[in-house]
């Protein structure tokens, strides 16, 4: 239905608390240079203007899209060119054309200092003197170097933050309290920002049809009880949503996610049983709760797939009359009949499926050609079984800083030409999915494995899109989003990489690396690794092992010495000698 | 909206030929091969022909081989059945259908063999 005006009618759905807490997120994700102060202000002013709305839906500018309305604030903002550039070169344009173009200058990379926790007391000091202050500059802090987080979702981690810190700040051992609770809520957060990112990137790059794809598989995974016409209505209001918190419509987003809890939770019967819990809990619990869902359990006695997608004389018929459709329901099938497959290998098989009747539908004996198809398919199942096999056998045996080591010379070697620090940061990334997936019972291990490497993959690629400095990561990250991590997983060293000339710097050490913090010191280890299969990215598996004992013992022995300096000055020059010489 | 409409029918003696066509509208014609099934009275549906998407492969099935031919007009979206040598055993409701499918999704077209 429409509404005089939307912003009332929004105002009025979420409540003054979540409404103020959407429109700093919304400013934050836009404007993620400008000081929180700045941003309180211009939220108590939308704010003021969305309650005179509600008095009177009539009032001047009570009408206006509320994009337009954003973007009206945004503009007035008087050191706009100053502090953003070539942002308020937007300004010129008239809506939409400038919201897409607000949407452009989101930086995905913003040069902002890490977000560091402060100590228990501080943090419950500023807590204690204003704690409505204090969430709204977690709301910025968060928005700014994460400007697609899924808003109503930052909503819920700002409410499980307060209630981390209601509750710790009264505790006599307050940092004990707090650590564990600020950690989970950190890492849960950060794997949330890139799910969304994921989900963004899909939309924007691949279009709705990606996106639907996606969601008709994890959805099917999730509620296999649940008919397909089901999913697919549900399918439709999350497509909305997503589209909405993407384009950084945050208020109708939130209202419309509500919107669908309330929808799933009245027609729970029809979907799972595993909703009743999440149901019973207040708005931004219950979406949460949705979103993180255990599956439910499979039906019994669901036919075998062939009976339906290769035994039936039709499957030319239904797929010419309704292709989506007919793919919509192969991918529905097959994905609630696996659960322990990853999204990305559901969708490659439903891809399999479609090539092969596009191909078969247009023989004369259709039904010949495609009567195999499932063995056809096996290959899409295998790989990456095998993959994950490989790899568990990897960490398993190296640990997570070993394998991340291994990570480090096999990504250099496919992508040469990316900056040290990306290779390190993206080896050590893919490391850590060891950790998270490799000690998981063999049916979720694989889902785990795939699922996370997409989202590292993607934060990649939206990274190397804004710097390109490799044509075949260009490549893996835009041909086909399904395919990007079989694509990353097929690259082998580069050939036409012209090996980097031996800078003595790069394998330099000091006597501070020793008093390093342990994280730290790996990542200076991992540069250096890095640095030498830069400058020979054929070297054998032996050579690097070699190279890499030389060097522990190096730091070992230097970092144990009475005259630190002293040592790692005489000895370095000899371990880059060594090194050269093992590599030669 | 998929539809596949025939025509051409009639009632001809045994010998005689008939053509008949099949208009196809509302799916990539080109990408999907076209069979003829046909219905005799008090019978089922029992396939005829098939011929894949570009038109260069056709198959027959031993009751029609050398008597009836199928071939198709992509930039028309037309399939046709030219049939020969005409027997009184070849009455029934010809269909044109997607792929292999042996159902009648159209209104289907009669030819019936008498003298």
């Known amino acids: 239905e429409a509404h005089k005006s939307e912003i009332a009618h929004r105002f009025n759905d979420l409540g003054e608390g979540h409404f103020k807490g959407l429109v700093l997120i919304t400013l934050s994700q836009h404007l993620q240079k400008s000081p929180f102060e700045e941003h309180v202000k211009l939220v108590n002013e939308v704010t003021d203007f969305a309650k005179a709305c509600v008095a009177d839906e009539s009032a001047q500018n009570c009408g206006k899209a509320i994009a337009t309305l954003f973007g009206d604030k945004v503009c007035a903002i008087p050191s706009l060119r100053e502090t953003y550039g070539e942002l308020a070169d937007c300004c010129a344009k008239e809506d939409p054309d400038r919201v897409e173009c607000f949407l452009q200058h989101k930086d995905d990379n913003p040069n902002l200092p890490p977000f560091e926790r402060p100590e228990p007391e501080a943090l419950c000091t500023a807590f204690k003197e204003n704690n409505d202050r204090f969430i709204g500059h977690y709301l910025y802090e968060v928005s700014r170097r994460h400007p697609y987080f899924y808003a109503p979702e930052l909503l819920y981690y700002a409410e499980k933050y307060k209630n981390a810190l209601t509750e710790c700040c009264e505790a006599a051992d307050k940092a004990a309290c707090l650590t564990p609770k600020l950690d989970a809520i950190k890492e849960k957060a950060l794997v949330s920002s890139a799910q969304q990112r994921l989900k963004c990137a899909s939309l924007q790059k691949f279009g709705e049809r990606a996106f639907k794809a996606w969601s008709v598989a994890r959805l099917s995974q999730k509620f296999p009880k649940a008919e397909f016409a089901e999913i697919s209505t549900i399918v439709t209001s999350l497509t909305k949503v997503t589209k909405e918190c993407c384009h950084g419509d945050l208020l109708e987003c939130a209202d419309d996610r509500q919107e669908l809890a309330k929808y799933m939770c009245e027609h729970q019967d029809s979907i799972s049983s595993k909703l009743k819990e999440c149901c019973v809990k207040p708005t931004l619990q219950k979406a949460h709760c949705i979103l993180e869902i255990q599956r439910d359990e499979l039906p019994t006695e669901l036919p075998d797939l062939a009976v339906d997608f290769v035994e039936d004389k039709e499957v030319c018929k239904n797929f010419a009359e309704a292709k989506d459709v007919f793919l919509g329901t192969f991918l529905y099938e097959y994905s609630r009949r696996h659960p322990e497959y990853s999204i990305g290998m559901l969708l490659r098989i439903a891809k399999g499926y479609e090539a092969k009747l596009e191909k078969c539908c247009a023989e004369a004996d259709p039904h010949a050609c495609y009567a195999k198809v499932f063995d056809e398919l096996q290959p899409l199942i295998d790989e990456p079984k095998k993959l994950v096999q490989q790899n568990c056998e990897l960490f398993d045996k190296l640990g997570e800083y070993g394998f991340q080591n291994a990570l480090a010379v096999r990504y250099t070697q496919k992508a040469p030409q990316v900056s040290t620090p990306t290779l390190v940061e993206y080896a050590r990334k893919l490391g850590s999915v060891g950790t998270k997936c490799c000690s998981l019972p063999e049916t979720e291990r694989l889902s785990c494995t795939e699922n996370y490497l997409a989202l590292i993959l993607n934060r990649l690629c939206i990274l190397h899109e804004k710097t390109p400095v490799s044509e075949r990561v260009t490549k893996c990250c835009t041909e086909s989003l399904v395919n990007r991590r079989p694509c990353f997983s097929a690259l082998h060293v580069d050939e036409t990489y012209v090996p980097k000339p031996f800078h003595a710097d790069s394998f330099t050490f000091h006597a501070d690396i020793c008093t390093l913090p342990e994280k730290e010191k790996q990542v200076k280890k991992q540069m250096a690794l890095v640095e030498l299969v830069k400058h020979k990215p054929k070297a054998s598996e032996e050579q690097m092992k070699t190279v890499m004992g030389d060097f522990a013992a190096f730091l070992k022995k230097c970092c144990d010495a009475d005259n630190k300096e002293a040592c790692f000055t005489e000895d370095g020059p000899k371990l880059v000698a060594k090194c050269q010489a093992t590599l030669a | 909206e998929v539809q596949l409409v025939e025509s051409g029918g009639g009632v001809v003696q045994p010998g005689n030929s008939l053509r008949l066509s099949c208009a196809a509208s509302?799916?990539?014609?080109?990408?999907?091969?076209m069979s003829w099934v046909r219905q005799a009275p008090g019978k089922g549906l029992e396939w005829v022909s098939s011929?894949?998407?570009?038109?260069?492969?056709?198959l027959y099935a031993d009751s029609v081989k050398g008597r009836f031919t199928i071939s198709r007009d992509n930039a028309k979206t037309t399939l046709y059945l030219q049939m020969n040598s005409l027997r009184p055993e070849d009455t029934a409701l010809y269909y044109c259908?997607?792929?292999?499918?042996?159902?009648?999704s159209s209104q289907g077209t009669l030819v019936t063999v008498s003298s």
């Open positions: 011929i894949s998407g570009s038109g260069s492969d056709t």
């Open positions: 509302g799916f990539t014609f080109s990408s999907f091969g």
């Open positions: 259908t997607i792929g292999g499918s042996l159902s009648r």
